[in-house]
C-alpha cells in the first residue's frame, strides 16, 4: 500500500477581484489520522487560511463535507477575492498529535493570481494657468490593478501625444500596482475647448479602456488684444471712444478708462460675446466732452485680466482739431508701444 499523497491538481488559478477562488486538493488515502490545513506561503511566516479542526474562517467554505468519514476532498473556496489574496496556497495534511498536530505532507501548491481592474484614471493639470506657447504638464494616475502589465496613452483632441513619461510601481512583485504618467502639452490660443485624455488599457478591461480627462479651459489663459478707436461725433462737443477687448479667456476682466492719467471709469466685463474658439470679446466705450478740455486729451484703456498685470492701449484726442475731422483710428501716442503694462 503506497502512502498518502496530497494532490493539488492546479498549478495556478486566475480569479478576478470580487469573485470566488476554488483551490482544489485531494488526499489519496484516509490515513493518517489528522486534519488538513490550508496555508498561503511556505516556511515559518506562512499564513493560515483554513484549519479543518478548529477556528473561524468566514471567507472560506469547503467544497465537500469534511465531517464525512470517507471524505478525501479538501478543496476550498475563498470568497470576495482581492489583490491582497494573491500568493501560493498549500494544502497540508497533519498527523494528529499532542500537544500539537504534526505536519505530515504538503501538496505542491497552487498559485492564486488575482486580476484587478485599474481605478478610473485621474488627470490633473498645473496649479496655475499658463498662456499659449507655454508647455504645461499633466499627470495621470490609476491604482489597484493586477497583473502589472498595463498600457497608458495620452491624447489631445484625439491626437496621440508622444512627450510623456510613465512609471508603474512597485518595480518588484506586489499584490497590486499603480501607474503614474506625466505628459507635456504645448498650449495654443485655440485650446480653450481642447481636452487632454489619459487612456489606460488592461487585461481586466476586455478591450474597453478607461479614460480620464482634463479640460484645457481650466489650464489656459489667453490674454486679450486691445484696440482703442474714436467713433464719429455724436454731438458737436462730444467724442465717443471705444476699447475693443478681443480673444481673452477666462472671462474675469476689469477695464479702467483714464483721461490724462486720471481714472475716469472702472467696469467689469459682463455682457461678453463668445467666439467659436471659446475666447471672449468685449467692448467698452467712453463719451468724452471735448469742450471741457483746453488741451489735447490722452485716453487710456487699461485692462486687468484674470489677476494678471494690467495691459493698456492709449489714444490721443486733439482738442484743437474739429472732432469731425478726427480719424477713426488715430495712432496712439508717439512714445512707443501701443500696448504696455501700467504700474
Amino acid at each position: 500500500e503506497e502512502e498518502l499523497q496530497v494532490i493539488q491538481p492546479d498549478k495556478s488559478v486566475l480569479v478576478a477581484a470580487g469573485e470566488t477562488a476554488t483551490l482544489r486538493c485531494t488526499a489519496t488515502s484516509l490515513i493518517p489520522v489528522g486534519p488538513i490545513q490550508w496555508f498561503r506561503g511556505a516556511g515559518p511566516g506562512r499564513e493560515l487560511i483554513y484549519n479543518q479542526k478548529e477556528g473561524h474562517f468566514p471567507r472560506v467554505t469547503t467544497v465537500s463535507d469534511l465531517t464525512k468519514r470517507n471524505n478525501m476532498d479538501f478543496s476550498i473556496r475563498i470568497g470576495n477575492i482581492t489583490p491582497a489574496d494573491a500568493g501560493t496556497y498549500y494544502c497540508v495534511k497533519f498527523r494528529k498529535g499532542s500537544p500539537d498536530d504534526v505536519e505530515f505532507k504538503s501538496g505542491a501548491g497552487t498559485e492564486l493570481s488575482v486580476r484587478a481592474k485599474p481605478s478610473a484614471p485621474v488627470v490633473s493639470g498645473p496649479a496655475a494657468r499658463a498662456t499659449p506657447q507655454h508647455t504645461v504638464s499633466f499627470t495621470c494616475e490609476s491604482h489597484g490593478f493586477s497583473p502589472r502589465d498595463i498600457t497608458l496613452k495620452w491624447f489631445k483632441n484625439g491626437n496621440e501625444l508622444s512627450d510623456f513619461q510613465t512609471n508603474v510601481d512597485p518595480v518588484g512583485e506586489s499584490v497590486s500596482y499603480s501607474i503614474h504618467s506625466t505628459a507635456k502639452v504645448v498650449l495654443t490660443r485655440e485650446d480653450v475647448h481642447s481636452q487632454v485624455i489619459c487612456e489606460v488599457a488592461h487585461v481586466t478591461l476586455q478591450g474597453d479602456p478607461l479614460r480620464g480627462t482634463a479640460n484645457l479651459s481650466e489650464t489656459i489663459r489667453v490674454p486679450p488684444t486691445l484696440e482703442v478707436t474714436q467713433q464719429p461725433v455724436r454731438a458737436e462737443n462730444q467724442v465717443n471712444v471705444t476699447c475693443q477687448v478681443r480673444k481673452f479667456y477666462p472671462q474675469r476682466l476689469q477695464l479702467t478708462w483714464l483721461e490724462n492719467g486720471n481714472v475716469s471709469r472702472t467696469e467689469t466685463a459682463s455682457t461678453v460675446t463668445e467666439n467659436k474658439d471659446g475666447t471672449y470679446n468685449w467692448m467698452s466705450w467712453l463719451l468724452v466732452n471735448v469742450s471741457a478740455h483746453r488741451d489735447d486729451v490722452k485716453l487710456t484703456c487699461q485692462v486687468e485680466h484674470d489677476g494678471q498685470p494690467a495691459v493698456s492701449k492709449s489714444h490721443d484726442l486733439k482738442v484743437s482739431a474739429h472732432p469731425k475731422e478726427q480719424g477713426s483710428n488715430t495712432a496712439a501716442e508717439n512714445t512707443g508701444s501701443n500696448e504696455r503694462n501700467i504700474y
Epitope: 500500500e1 503506497e2 502512502e3 504538503s106
Partner: antibody, heavy 118, light 107 residues
C-alpha cells in the same frame, strides 16, 4: 522482500557524534515514510525520529529535538540518523523501520547497537 | 503523551495453550493499536494493526480485539516459535508510545 539493514553503530564517548545509516531494498523507498526506533538494554521501545517520503517533514519527540536529526537520500535508498552530544542514556539498539503514513511500523531492521561510554 | 500499560510483564505457558496479553491506554486511542513480536537479536515483526487486522502472512492463531482504551492480543494455540516478547504500540496520536512488553516463556 522488504529488507532494512542498519549500520554505523559502535562505541562512542559522551558528547561525541555518530551517524547511523539504513539501506532499504525490496520496495519503492521514495514512496514510504521511515523512522528510527530505539531500545535501551532491558528497557522499552521509543520512537527517535520520523521522516516523510520526500524528506520535506520530520518529527522528533521533545526529548530528542536538537540532538538527533533524521534525513534520507531517496536516490540511494538510504535513511540516516545524525546523533550529536551523545549521552550514556542514548545507549541502545537503534532500529530502522518502515513507517507508512506515520501510522504503525510494518517492517523493521535487525538493529545496530550504539554504546555511549567513556 | 498517551501511556500504554501492558500486562502481564511476563507469562509462562505451554505449547497448545491459549494466551491473552492486554494493553490499556491512558485515553481513547480509537483502535489505532498495533501488536508486534520480538525475538532476541531479531528484527521486530508486526502481527496486528488497527487493533484487530492481521498482517499478511501472520498465522490465524493470532488475533486482536478491543476498543476505546482496552485492547487484547490472543494466541489461540501456542506454538514453539511463539515464545518471544510482545509489544503494543498506540498510533492514534504523536508521539506514538509503546507498552513496556510482555515476555512469553515456555513453562
Amino acid at each position: 522482500e522488504v529488507q532494512l539493514v542498519e549500520s554505523g553503530g559502535g562505541l562512542v564517548q559522551p558528547g561525541g557524534s555518530l551517524r547511523l545509516s539504513c539501506a532499504a531494498s525490496g520496495f519503492t523507498f521514495s514512496s514510504f515514510s521511515m523512522s528510527w526506533v530505539r531500545q535501551a538494554p532491558g528497557k522499552g521501545l521509543e520512537v527517535v525520529a520520523t521522516i516523510n517520503s520526500d524528506g520535506s517533514n520530520t518529527y522528533e519527540p521533545g526529548n530528542m529535538k536538537g540532538r538527533f536529526t533524521i534525513s534520507r537520500d531517496n536516490a540511494k535508498n538510504s535513511l540516516y540518523l545524525q546523533m550529536n552530544s551523545l549521552r550514556a542514556e542514548d545507549t541502545a539498539v537503534y532500529y530502522c523501520a518502515r513507517d507508512p503514513n506515520w501510522d504503525y511500523f510494518d517492517f523493521w531492521g535487525q538493529g545496530t547497537l550504539v554504546t555511549v561510554s567513556s | 503523551d498517551i501511556q500504554m500499560t501492558q500486562s502481564p510483564s511476563s507469562l509462562s505457558a505451554s505449547v497448545g495453550d491459549r494466551v491473552t496479553i492486554t494493553c490499556k491506554a491512558s485515553q481513547d486511542i480509537n483502535s489505532y493499536l498495533t501488536w508486534f513480536q520480538q525475538k532476541p537479536g531479531k528484527a521486530p515483526k508486526t502481527l496486528i494493526y488497527r487493533a484487530n487486522r492481521l498482517v499478511d502472512g501472520v498465522p490465524s492463531r493470532f488475533s486482536g480485539s478491543g476498543s476505546g482504551t482496552d485492547y487484547t492480543l490472543t494466541i489461540s494455540s501456542l506454538q514453539p516459535e511463539d515464545f518471544a516478547t510482545y509489544y503494543c504500540l498506540q498510533y492514534d496520536e504523536f508521539p506514538r508510545t509503546f507498552g513496556q512488553g510482555t515476555k512469553l516463556e515456555i513453562k
